[in-house]
């Protein structure tokens, strides 16, 4: 990792596992966009690979609500509204950081967790496997 | 918020702003996927709305490296490889949580921050077909 110069104004850590356990201020710095993707974009309906958004809720996780995209079709929508099965709608996935309460139910102790979420869908050309 | 039953085995918090400041274990729980999106999928190249991935690095942030998608074209790519301007390539954006060192350079004190990242691109059309 990158060596960070110690600032004399930093909080002290008595934790034996330092720097694996750190203090985190949950007062989120910038809230300039909506957490509900339906409010922040309507691409899910206008895309040639449209998707539906499913609410995933877990009170032991922060954020407790995450929206998961599920592609509506196997193929992609053409200009005439029909589905073209020569193309594929596929989910674009991203790893995100969440905080998991650990031990469970503890209000002020968390563990960092990486989870894979589907953010939306895109239309791709299928991989053609040429059989010898 | 949801009321969490207090577990007697929970760490104690003396912070006056509790529960805004919490303890977080940075030992990430599941690393089952690759953090470099170029390794985890080739959709960025096969999509009708292809994108390039740009590395955004910030040592004051955790994770310090984030990949940003930039759509390659204004239009979408047709089967013959030409760009179709009857449609647009647009970035799918998602809010993610990151940890920002606060005060700056402190190794064990962070603030939660929401940032908007472009994860990939999708192809949108002006004609919306409401599929049942």
């Amino acid at each position: 990792g990158i060596a960070i110069p110690r600032n004399s104004g930093c909080p002290n850590s008595e934790d034996k596992n330092f720097p694996r356990t750190v203090m985190v201020n949950l007062n989120i710095h910038n809230r300039n966009t909506s957490t509900n993707p339906k409010r922040s974009s309507d691409y899910y309906n206008r895309s040639t690979s449209p998707w539906n958004l499913h609410r995933n809720e877990d009170p032991e996780r922060y954020p407790s609500v995450i929206w998961e995209a599920k592609c509506r079709h196997l193929g992609c929508v053409k200009a005439d509204g029909n589905v073209d099965y020569h193309m594929n709608s596929v989910p674009i996935q991203q790893e995100i950081l969440v905080l998991r309460r650990e031990p469970r139910h503890c209000p002020n102790s968390f563990r960092l967790e990486k989870i894979l979420v589907s953010v939306g869908c895109t239309c791709v050309t299928p991989i053609v496997h040429h059989v010898a | 918020g949801i009321a969490i039953p207090r577990n007697s085995g929970c760490p104690n918090s003396e912070d006056k702003n509790f529960p805004r400041t919490v303890m977080v274990n940075l030992n990430i729980h599941n690393r089952n996927t690759s953090t470099n999106p170029k390794r985890s999928s080739d959709y960025y190249n096969r999509s009708t709305s292809p994108w390039n991935l740009h590395r955004n690095e910030d040592p004051e942030r955790y994770p310090s490296v984030i990949w940003e998608a930039k759509c390659r074209h204004l239009g979408c790519v047709k089967a013959d490889g030409n760009v179709d301007y009857h449609m647009n390539s647009v970035p799918i954006q998602q809010e993610i949580l990151v940890l920002r060192r606060e005060p700056r350079h402190c190794p064990n004190s962070f603030r939660l921050e929401k940032i908007l990242v472009s994860v990939g691109c999708t192809c949108v059309t002006p004609i919306v077909h409401h599929v049942a």
Partner: antibody
Amino acid sequence: EVQLLESGGGLVQPGGSLRLSCAASGFTFSSYAMSWVRQAPGKGLEWVSAISGSGGSTYYADSVKGRFTISRDNSKNTLYLQMNSLRAEDTAVYYCARDLIWGVAGSWGQGTLVTVSS
Amino acid sequence: NFMLTQPHSVSESPGKTVTISCTRSSGSLANYYVQWYQQRPGSSPTIVIFANNQRPSGVPDRFSGSIDSSSNSASLTISGLKTEDEADYYCQSYDPHSVVFGGGTKLTVL
């Protein structure tokens, strides 16, 4: 219902500056490209500038390139047009429009009049 | 930049059909959508046809759009003319770098 409300127009001297705003409502602002179109008194429509939904791409007519700057604040659902080095020929009603895709303006505001005169 | 050429004015009687043409000077019209806007005196433009032939909700089916690739032109046809159709009509198209409007056609309903 899509609503676009322009403001910021007025009388300005040649060489002066003005900033137009367009407050949008009734749709998910950040997922639509937006444009500015103007109409000189008694004349036809002239496209001025456009910006992508994320704000990452901007486009300008040759007549305003280097003088006008389009921008947007998606957290405020607002589109802007910063107009510098104004000329008499910039006198027009300025409309903001919501683009269904690039080049396809679907909804228009009521316009704001900019008069450049000494 | 390309140009879009429209007739300066057209006139027709109520109940009849009128067609307004729009010719693109360069670049294939079929590669980019054509839109048509109606502007009544003292009002903002409103879209009556987008994406060559799509009618927004609220626009009567008396309005229709088409394109002819062979002549590189688009047409707006209004059937069953009504007095409220009297307005200026603008065609509009684009390329990857700019958006262009036609000069406008004044429709007079006699």
